[in-house]
């Protein structure tokens, strides 16, 4: 059977995730979970440095 | 060719235990999250939980109409994977099918059958 | 739990006629992260186990026949097989797994006239 990769690097994510399709990785707790248990990242105001909280690696296959 | 081949279905009754295995082939066991469904008799589909695969811990997530009563563990070495259902009710006698979880539920074994009944 | 509700729970249709199926889910299933819809449609004929036949709403499963497309975004999404084949005869379901636990339709009966 044909195993892709688990996820394509994206622009703004530093490393492929451990997670499989289905699920979201969790920056914050550093494990997979369901995608609806995150909050999508925010665009940041100008001249904020800081993340956004509980932002997801996970994009599109 | 991907294979899930559940078995150890039957009749128990009210109170008791048993062990449903899911024997997988085709693909490596290890790189994939594996879950359980079940389908009471002419009734919709339910969803009892999952196992993720080594690179996320083997960590579990159940539904809570279930949690406490059943434990979804795998022995990777046999490429099997376990559904221990404890204090079994009437209300637990379904179709049990294992299922690997990928994009969603990709690929379903054939099920297996448990009645729960005195 | 969010709850999905499928519509109609059965309908019967001639070989050739075009079908489609609702299922509406009780809060949105989109991840505006990567825009994907957290849903799935399985397709269970008689005595057979489910079968994967869409993912993400709307991306089909591979070796599953373009007549079966799905659709919608958020809370309401859809299943429509453009010309029906008699072995198209099935329950189908939808499911979230936009969040635990993953939840199911009560299922759509396709029967053949």
């Known amino acids: 059977m044909r195993r892709g990769p688990r996820s394509l690097r994206g622009r703004d994510a530093p490393a492929p995730t451990p997670c499989v399709p289905a699920e979201c990785f969790d920056l914050l707790v550093r494990h997979c979970v369901a995608c609806g248990l995150l909050r999508a990242p925010r665009p940041k105001p100008a001249g904020a440095s800081s993340p956004a909280p509980r932002t997801a690696l996970q994009p599109q296959e | 060719e991907v294979k899930l081949v559940e078995s150890g279905g039957g009749l128990v009754q009210p109170g008791g235990s048993l062990r449903l295995s899911c024997a997988i082939s085709?693909?490596?066991?290890?790189?994939?999250?594996m879950s359980w469904v079940r389908q009471p008799p002419g009734k919709a589909l339910e969803w009892l939980g999952f196992?993720?695969?080594?690179?996320?811990?083997?960590?579990?997530e159940y539904n809570p109409s279930v949690k406490g009563r059943f434990t979804i563990s795998r022995d990777n070495s046999q490429s099997i994977f376990y559904l221990q259902m404890n204090t079994l009710r009437a209300e637990d006698s379904a179709t049990y099918y294992c299922a690997q979880v990928r994009r969603a539920l990709d690929y379903w074994g054939q099920g297996t059958t448990v009645t729960v009944s005195a | 739990d969010i709850v999905m509700s499928q519509s109609p729970s059965s309908l019967a249709v001639s070989v050739g006629e075009k079908v489609t199926m609702s299922c509406k889910s009780s809060q949105s299933l989109l991840y505006s992260s990567n825009q994907n819809n957290y849903l799935a449609w399985y397709q269970q004929k008689p005595g057979q186990s489910p079968k994967l036949l869409i993912y993400?709403?709307?991306t089909r499963e591979s070796g599953v026949p373009d007549r079966f497309t799905g659709s919608g975004s958020g809370t309401d999404f859809t299943l429509t097989i453009s010309s029906v084949k008699a072995e198209d005869l099935a329950v189908y379901y939808c499911?979230?797994?936009?969040?635990?636990?993953?939840?199911f339709g009560g299922g759509t009966k396709l029967e053949i006239k």
């Open positions: 993400w709403a709307s």
């Open positions: 196992i993720r695969d080594k690179a996320n811990g083997y960590t579990t």
């Open positions: 499911q979230q797994y936009y969040t635990y636990p993953y939840t």
């Open positions: 085709g693909f490596t066991v290890t790189a994939y999250y």
